[in-house]
């Protein structure tokens, strides 16, 4: 009798249960970017290491051609850090008619591309003015949040200036996502 | 009959399922650091509060001697924020032959130690030049990402200068990890 | 016989298992803030979009009156980013008796309110001195960590100066939480 009482709820909730270990997951790490032309008003996408060192993709989460491919619908936590580095930004020295000029800036955007949708969707943006005085500078921008994604969605990381990205260490610049 | 049809798939997927509530988890919070000797070229590790206030460890995730001990293999999300504070860095004012000197910087590293492996592995690094003008300064560095860890791995947080860490509030400087 | 051997462990661990898809989750995005009175020494709370664009609440996680309501006890990952923007902070130029004045700053606090407890609890704080030279400035503060919450707890995001918050884009300023 006890078994019979238990069965219905067991059957009712069983279907959506799944082992955590088989959920799509990826952690990608920075590689040196190859020289490419990119349009002036479009932020270029970074490409990534997906299997060497700390990088991995698993459970049908694949990386191809700068994109992470989402293999199943659900809620994902998505994160990225990009470390930027540069020589002095002279933004504080150049003034027009005594007025501060537009600051230099660094920006990271995590973008979702859905094939059935014409425009990419910006999921996360970190943007920072850079107005350093008298020295080299370096700093990270970190982003992370949860989004509902559909099977077939593609994720990429875009930056305002690819030449400012620190590609020297896998722990400084990275990109990841995992199904919750 | 229905039960018989259901049984195979139940037995097949059941083993790896586990209750979310029993997964290893920890959130550690800052405490005032005790002065310790550390080698000149090695970043010192922070020690942490693990049970008072917001801090906790649970489900066999233990904290001991600056390390979080990983009790079972799997994919973990690891995070830390360190808030730094200091007096004015005059890096922009001191010049050699009209040349800006090397900037001061603040750095946080989350490091993995595996007993069977001679060298620690840097999992995450946040590093920032500090060239503030005319005032005291304070700022956080935040890090977080997912890594595949093995049972017995140990995690610690290293900083470039322990004397600059803001230890005054548990919400400003913290370190955590949880099994996904 | 096999079924009988299996049953006890099944019944023993079954109760806490639950489908990941039915866990409380929310991602809230920035909206333009309505002018409100707030006490001088108290950081104002932001209000949020909870259903348009990228924003959502699900599985009994509700948003009401600047608060996220926690519908069940457990360990939650909570995160927020606030992008600030402002005109030049002249903090380095104004000195009293040759001494640098107290720097301007920007601060984000994620706060927990428990009705049975008189004082709100600050879970996370990101605070940064702002001493920019010669230009407009903008920058994000990101926070994220895991906390043990109780059913009925309420979460909000407070900022040091609501007029500096960039409310222009949903990907720049956001707040979220999900049950682990």
């Amino acid at each position: 009798l006890k078994g019979q009482e238990f069965a219905p709820s067991h059957q009712q909730v069983y279907a959506p249960l799944r082992a955590d270990g088989d959920k799509p997951r990826a952690h990608l790490t920075v590689v040196r970017q190859t020289p490419t032309q990119h349009f002036k008003n479009q932020f270029p996408a970074l490409h990534w290491e997906h299997e060497l060192g700390l990088a991995f993709t698993k459970n049908r989460m694949n990386y191809t051609n700068k994109f992470l491919l989402i293999p199943e619908s659900g809620d994902y936590f998505i994160y990225s850090q990009v470390t930027f580095r540069g020589m002095t930004s002279e933004c504080s020295e150049i003034r027009q008619a005594g007025r501060p000029n537009k600051p230099d800036s660094i920006t990271v955007v995590i973008t979702k591309v859905t094939d059935s949708y014409p425009e990419p969707t910006q999921l996360l943006m970190g943007t920072k003015s850079v107005c350093e005085v008298g020295s080299n500078w370096f700093q990270p921008i970190y982003l992370g949040a949860m989004f509902s994604l559909q099977e077939g969605d593609k994720l990429m990381v875009n930056v305002s200036d690819i030449s400012l990205v620190d590609y020297t260490k896998e722990d400084k610049t990275f990109f990841g996502a995992f199904l919750l | 009959l229905k039960g018989q049809e259901f049984a195979p798939s139940h037995q097949q997927v059941y083993a790896p399922l586990r209750a979310d509530g029993d997964k290893p988890r920890a959130h550690l919070t800052v405490v005032r650091q005790t002065p310790t000797q550390h080698f000149k070229n090695q970043f010192p590790a922070l020690h942490w509060e693990h049970e008072l206030g917001l801090a906790f460890t649970k489900n066999r995730m233990n904290y001991t001697n600056k390390f979080l001990l990983i009790p079972e293999s799997g994919d973990y999300f690891i995070y830390s924020q360190v808030t730094f504070r200091g007096m004015t860095s005059e890096c922009s004012e001191i010049r050699q032959a009209g040349r800006p000197n090397k900037p001061d910087s603040i750095t946080v590293v989350i490091t993995k130690v595996t007993d069977s492996y001679p060298e620690p592995t840097q999992l995450l690094m946040g590093t920032k030049s500090v060239c503030e003008v005319g005032s005291n300064w304070f700022q956080p560095i935040y890090l977080g990402a997912m890594f595949s860890l093995q049972e017995g791995d140990k995690l610690m947080v290293n900083v470039s200068d322990i004397s600059l860490v803001d230890y005054t509030k548990e919400d400003k400087t913290f370190f955590g990890a949880f099994l996904l | 016989l096999k079924g009988q051997e299996f049953a006890p462990s099944h019944q023993q661990v079954y109760a806490p298992l639950r489908a990941d898809g039915d866990k409380p989750r929310a991602h809230l995005t920035v909206v333009r803030q309505t002018p409100t009175q707030h006490f001088k020494n108290q950081f104002p709370a932001l209000h949020w979009e909870h259903e348009l664009g990228l924003a959502f609440t699900k599985n009994r996680m509700n948003y009401t009156n600047k608060f996220l309501l926690i519908p069940e006890s457990g360990d939650y990952f909570i995160y927020s980013q606030v992008t600030f923007r402002g005109m030049t902070s002249e903090c380095s130029e104004i000195r009293q008796a040759g001494r640098p004045n107290k720097p301007d700053s920007i601060t984000v606090v994620i706060t927990k309110v428990t009705d049975s407890y008189p004082e709100p609890t600050q879970l996370l704080m990101g605070t940064k001195s702002v001493c920019e030279v010669g230009s407009n400035w903008f920058q994000p503060i990101y926070l994220g960590a895991m906390f043990s919450l109780q059913e009925g707890d309420k979460l909000m995001v407070n900022v040091s100066d609501i007029s500096l918050v960039d409310y222009t884009k949903e990907d720049k300023t956001f707040f979220g939480a999900f049950l682990l």
């Epitope: 040196r32 190859t34 020289p35 580095r85 200036d161 | - | -």
Partner: antibody, heavy 119, light 111 residues
Framework: QVQLVQSGAEVKKPGASVKVSCKAS????????INWVRQAPGQGLEWMGW????????GYAQKFQGRVTMTADRSTSTAYMELSSLRSEDTAVYYC????????????WGQGTLVTVSS | QSVLTQPPSVSGAPGQRVTISCTSS?????????VHWYQQLPGTAPKLLIE???NRPSGVPDRFSGSKSGTSASLTITGLLPEDEGDYYC??????????FGGGTKLTVLG
């Protein structure tokens, strides 16, 4: 001390390929990117591309894309640059150079390899 | 496509000071990694003189210094010596992550 020793001079016919080697010593070969730079007689320096000896990843100048291949043999700490479909204007001294990771300056240079393309 | 422009030649007597300029066709000369300077003496491989606008690698005499102003970088040699005669190149990285070299400047030490 750090040394980059390149292979000897080569004479090639138009349309042929040449493979120049660069043997590294005095440092951990996989820790630094190698760049290749060439210099035509009486001309300036021209960058061809970079190689990461650890991963094998490469980045080539647009001008040489499709004609150049850079590889590494980690067991012998040797980098290679192969240029195909040679023409007379490829006559030059070819240099390998080790890069400073932080600034991407070319800190150490090989002695150069003269490649002559002539029918 | 960015271009780095150097004067084809400069000259000076021993003991004098000479400056070689390197001007970028784009506004952000070496924004990410700076401008580097190389010396190439006759019949030899280039040698790194200055990295990141200002920094002298060990072994480079302090007679060599680098500076930056707006879209130009400069190499200054003080106390010119006969053995400084040779070609000098500036180098940077453009926005597409391609390395650029200036056309080179021939330094002649008079006398």
């Amino acid at each position: 001390q750090v040394q980059l020793v390149q292979s000897g001079a080569e004479v090639k016919k138009p349309g042929a390929s040449v493979k120049v080697s660069c043997k590294a010593s005095g440092y951990t070969f996989t820790s630094y990117d190698i760049n290749w730079v060439r210099q035509a007689p009486g001309q300036g320096l021209e960058w061809m591309g970079w190689l990461n000896p650890n991963s094998g990843y490469t980045g080539y100048a647009q001008k040489f894309q499709g004609r150049v291949t850079m590889t590494a043999d980690r067991s012998t700490s040797t980098a290679y640059m192969e240029l195909s479909s040679l023409r007379s204007e490829d006559t030059a001294v070819y240099y390998c150079a080790r890069e400073v990771p932080e600034t991407a300056a070319f800190e150490y240079w090989g002695q150069g390899t003269l490649v002559t393309v002539s029918s | 496509q960015s271009v780095l422009t150097q004067p084809p030649s400069v000259s000076g007597a021993p003991g004098q000071r000479v400056t070689i300029s390197c001007t970028s066709s784009s506004s952000d000369i070496g924004a990410g990694l700076g401008v580097h300077w190389y010396q190439q003496l006759p019949g030899t491989a280039p040698k790194l003189l200055i990295e990141g606008y200002y920094n002298r690698p060990s072994g480079v005499p302090d007679r060599f210094s680098g500076s930056k102003s707006g879209t130009s970088a400069s190499l200054t040699i003080t106390g010119l010596l006969p053995e400084d005669e040779g070609d000098y190149y500036c180098q940077s990285w453009d926005g597409t992550l391609s390395a650029l070299f200036g056309g080179g400047t021939k330094l002649t030490v008079l006398g």
